[in-house]
């Protein structure tokens, strides 16, 4: 009876707990089931985000493998665009400034010849036979030789030639093709189908042929540059004139010393009026002449070097962009295909573990 | 294609005026100096002297100083030689010349000068 | 003012005669220029800086020289070469022609 009743009891208590446990199995088991099926809509999301955004994953997935092989030579295409729009800017200043400095260097030797017209009319002067003043007049005649302008500034040929050269070039838009190239780049993303197939026109090649042969890098800078520091006269005018004034203060008052103090007067102002707007044209000359001497130097192997890279990132998309694309998109497909993978086991665990 | 076209010929008596044009096209007329060079019958050349086309300042040789002006009407690229109160001595052809670099490049066909009573 | 000599003042050349136009400084120039002019027509650059040749001249022409002493040279002597010649010097200004050398054909 004893044991009966014990086996009895035992089995009250293990219904009771059956129960309980059937119990909570009937009221947990639809909220876990529930929280299941919820785990797939998130699964679904991310798939379908991913599908809605196939632009950016598998587009981006594609230009990130294409970019590093195009993006630079693009880049330097691009700087070497804005190389041309410099040098045409540079070779303009320095044409403009060439024809201004041979007008003014020819004006210059018009105003000296004629002051030293003057100085000689001057000297003709009575008083220049006369000892001490012909000491004087002697000192200044020997220095008229000096009032001279640097001839070699009316000979610096002028670089028409190069200047049409590099507005041909320009006739081409190599910005707007490098452009295209980075569009054409960009618009993968959105249009996997529709891949570049040319990373920079056959236009931009030869301009950048036409620009290594546009003459630039065979001027004779140093013939321009040996011009920008002499003198456009062949002795400072001012201390010239400055001088002048003294040896004129020296002599006795009357028209001799008259005259030379007016000549004095005239060389000061052909110092202010002649000689500053050269220095201020050799000054230009000399920035101008600096830009093209950077650019030039080089030009030919830096282009070179520059079509190298095109054909290189050119063969690069020619022959790679075809199986890119297939590896990406099996990289896409195994993505999607792993977030349901991934659902599928943890679905399999909780059930077996958890529930 | 650069040129420089002259007025026609002109025949002038003593003491009155002349006024000789050159027109230049082919290139911007600022950026070249204009001379004017004379020629005599029989005789050779003769430099007169120059204007500067971006200043219109003009120069003149010793011998046509006075009775000579250089002037520009820049907007119609023309240069103009005028001598006032004319000789005899004044009858030759006058060459406009633009010059860039130390000699001249292009000339004008000449503009033949008779001044006779 | 630089003058400029011409030597000699005429001449004559046979078809395929050598033929040299001399033309003295008074002082030093850095260049010469010469100009071809026929009658009726105007002066023609013809060679500048010296020695080179302008647009359109035939190869048998040069120019040599330094200093005060400069030429014109034309190897062979043909027809259309009877013109008048200048030298003409820009060194030092004012600008100044030769008096010129008529080379006449015989």
């Known amino acids: 009876n004893h044991q009966v009743r014990t086996r009895i009891k035992r089995s009250r208590k293990l219904a009771d707990s059956n129960f309980k446990d059937l119990r909570t199995l009937l009221n947990e088991t639809p909220e876990q089931i529930k929280y299941i099926l919820a785990q797939y809509n998130t699964t679904k999301d991310k798939a379908f985000t991913d599908l809605n955004s196939i632009n950016s994953v598998l587009g981006g997935g594609i230009l990130d493998r294409l970019r590093p092989n195009i993006i630079p030579v693009l880049d330097e295409i691009k700087s070497m665009a804005t190389a041309i729009k410099e040098t045409k800017e540079a070779l303009e200043n320095m044409n403009s400034t060439l024809k201004s400095l041979h007008q003014q260097s020819t004006q210059l030797s018009s105003s000296l010849t004629s002051v030293k017209t003057s100085l000689r009319s001057s000297l003709n002067d009575p008083l220049c036979l006369v000892h001490p003043s012909s000491e004087t007049c002697n000192s200044i005649r020997l220095s008229l030789s000096q009032l001279n302008s640097n001839p070699e500034l009316r000979q610096l040929p002028p670089v028409d030639a190069e200047l049409d050269n590099v507005n041909n070039v320009l006739r081409t838009d190599l910005d707007g093709l490098v452009q295209q190239g980075y569009q054409s780049l960009n618009d993968i993303p959105d249009r996997v189908q529709r891949q570049t197939t040319t990373v920079v026109a056959a236009a931009g090649r030869k301009n950048l042929q036409d620009f290594a042969a546009c003459g630039i890098d065979r001027m004779n800078y140093d013939s321009y540059l040996a011009q920008t520091g002499k003198s456009p006269a062949g002795v400072n005018l001012l201390s010239f004139a400055y001088d002048l004034e003294a040896k004129a203060n020296s002599l006795p008052p009357g028209n001799l010393r008259n005259s030379l103090k007016r000549d004095a007067q005239t060389i000061k102002t052909i110092h202010q009026q002649r000689v500053l707007p050269i220095e201020q044209s050799l000054s230009t000359l000399y920035q101008s002449v600096k830009i093209l001497q950077r650019t030039g130097n080089g030009l030919l192997e830096r282009v070179t070097r520059i079509l190298a890279s095109l054909d290189f990132a050119q063969n690069f998309i020619t022959n790679n962009t075809s199986s890119v694309i297939i590896e990406e998109t099996k990289k896409y497909g195994r993505t999607i295909i792993g977030y349901f993978e991934h659902y599928l086991q943890w679905i399999e665990f909780s059930i077996s573990e958890k529930v | 294609e650069v040129k420089l076209v002259e007025s026609g010929p002109e025949l002038k008596k003593p003491g009155e005026t002349v006024k000789i044009s050159c027109k230049a096209s082919?290139?911007?007329?600022?950026?070249?100096?204009m001379h004017w060079v004379n020629q005599a019958p029989g005789k050779g050349l003769k430099w007169m002297g120059w204007i500067n086309t971006e200043t219109g300042e003009p120069s003149y040789a010793d011998d046509f100083k006075g009775r000579f002006a250089f002037s520009l009407e820049t907007s119609a690229s023309t240069a103009y030689l005028q001598i006032n109160n004319l000789k005899n001595e004044d009858t030759a052809t006058y060459f406009c010349a633009t010059d860039y670099g130390d000699y001249f490049d292009y000339w004008g066909q000449g503009t033949t000068l008779t001044v006779s009573s | 003012d630089i003058v400029l000599s011409q030597s000699p003042a005429i001449m004559s050349a046979s078809p395929g005669e050598k033929v040299t136009i001399s033309c003295s400084a008074s002082?030093?120039?850095?260049?010469m220029y010469w100009y071809q002019q026929k009658p009726g027509s105007s002066p023609k650059p013809w060679i500048y800086?010296?020695?080179n040749l302008a647009s359109g001249v035939p190869a048998r022409f040069s120019g040599s020289g330094s200093g005060t002493s400069y030429s014109l040279t034309i190897s062979s002597m043909e027809a259309e070469d009877a013109a008048t010649y200048y030298c003409q010097q820009y060194h030092s200004y004012p600008p100044t022609f030769g008096a010129g050398t008529k080379l006449e054909l015989k």
């Open positions: 082919g290139y911007t007329f600022t950026d070249y100096s």
């Open positions: 800086r010296t020695s």
């Open positions: 002082s030093s120039v850095s260049y």
